[in-house]
Amino acid sequence: SSSPTSSASSFSSSAPFLASAVSAQPPLPDQCPALCECSEAARTVKCVNRNLTEVPTDLPAYVRNLFLTGNQLAVLPAGAFARRPPLAELAALNLSGSRLDEVRAGAFEHLPSLRQLDLSHNPLADLSPFAFSGSNASVSAPSPLVELILNHIVPPEDERQNRSFEGMVVAALLAGRALQGLRRLELASNHFLYLPRDVLAQLPSLRHLDLSNNSLVSLTYVSFRNLTHLESLHLEDNALKVLHNGTLAELQGLPHIRVFLDNNPWVCDCHMADMVTWLKETEVVQGKDRLTCAYPEKMRNRVLLELNSADLDCDPILPPSLQTS
């Protein structure tokens, strides 16, 4: 994933007495928050694995890369990064693995340069629809976000709200059409059973989409037609049984696409014929010779590329009079 990485060589650790710095005062130019490491040369602040329960108030204005990973933040309130003067340079923010279960509306407001955001490995039971757009207007100001990393943000079963997790995430992605400039979206390992049909059409700038390690059974109602810039589509480790003609045609029509389909339980029956024909001709599927049948048992482990129409039969449906209860 594209979480911010640091080229910092010289970090200065804050002295403990800075912990009580008054947030109302503008931070000193070289000040570093308690429990953090700072490198002005690399424009990087790291507050990593420190069990912080809130975002430090006294972040230096120069910060471009901010790591707040491995903490205990729990809630990200509105304006969590709003400062005076604003953190105008902050471009990459990594909040992964910080026990966040709630991200409120406007949590990332007043970050005009924020291009990369990583919220992975947080059990987000409550992600506001306006977490990324900042307002509930039907059309919001465009977000500067280019990369949004949301891998493994699904909370445990017993902590989920009485609503679709997929729906909650998609609502946040689509609110106010703020993410029209998003180029990379990672949604791996979220137990998604389906992809709401309107989500991709409203993210026209996507170059990279990672939906790997979910539970997607079908792409029948998902349209890739508008994603003319899409370069990589990761669908490995899902529950896909077959790709149908409509999906195959749409993928083939994308000029730069590479599709990853490994580790899916392909069902090699009569419904697979179109996909097999397509696989033999297409160049868009990476490692296509590694796609093998999972079902029926007699076909298990066979390479899809080696199948022909005679191999792909469906058991005849018995007339009602012959069916057993």
Epitope: D237, N263, R290, T292, A294, R300, V303, L305, E306
Partner: antibody, heavy 116, light 107 residues
Amino acid sequence: QVQLQQFGAELVKPGAAVKMSCKASGYTFTSYWITWVKQRPGQGLDWIGDIYPGGGSTNYHEKFKSKATLTVDTSSSTAYMQLSSLTSEDSAVYYCARGLRDFDYWGQGTTITVSS
Amino acid sequence: DIQMTQTASSLSASLGDRVTISCRASQHINNYLNWYQQKPDGTVKLLIYSTSRLHSGVPSRFSGSGSGTDFSLTISNLEPEDIATYYCQQYSKLPRTFGGGTKLEIK
């Protein structure tokens, strides 16, 4: 029925190379990947790599990349593994097996002994 | 690489016993786990694939369960021909890796 036939044992000298075979029968050879596994005496199983007979694609475990070379001859439904620059560490039983993720049929193994 | 750990390198049981062999992965592997039996003569057979699915021809006294990182193979009614070494293997990532094996012996 599916069978993978491997041949007995070979004694080879240190520094030499050896090429072992795995003849498949009872199924369409090009339709299934072939995997190779190493087992040192009294030890567990170690995945070496796999090959797709229908197109020749291979994957190797990093630690065997400069040691093993996997090939196939589709006309005889036979997979081969060549081991180069042999040392005593290469003394082991080498199995071929059918499959890419689970290995549903195994050969009986070829024992390689490296000794001067 | 994903490490597969079989904590018991050997187990002793009586005929007719219910025996459980465990296997742990160093990271989450979904249900991408297989079990093999290696007889003393070196013969290797697939028993269980995808954590819990019985390979054709394998007796129904063998069963598999687990998910994520912790898995087990159970033999419900131990028979003399079950004396063997049992290996787990993950296929979540390359390289494929095996557990160290659990040798099953008769008391």
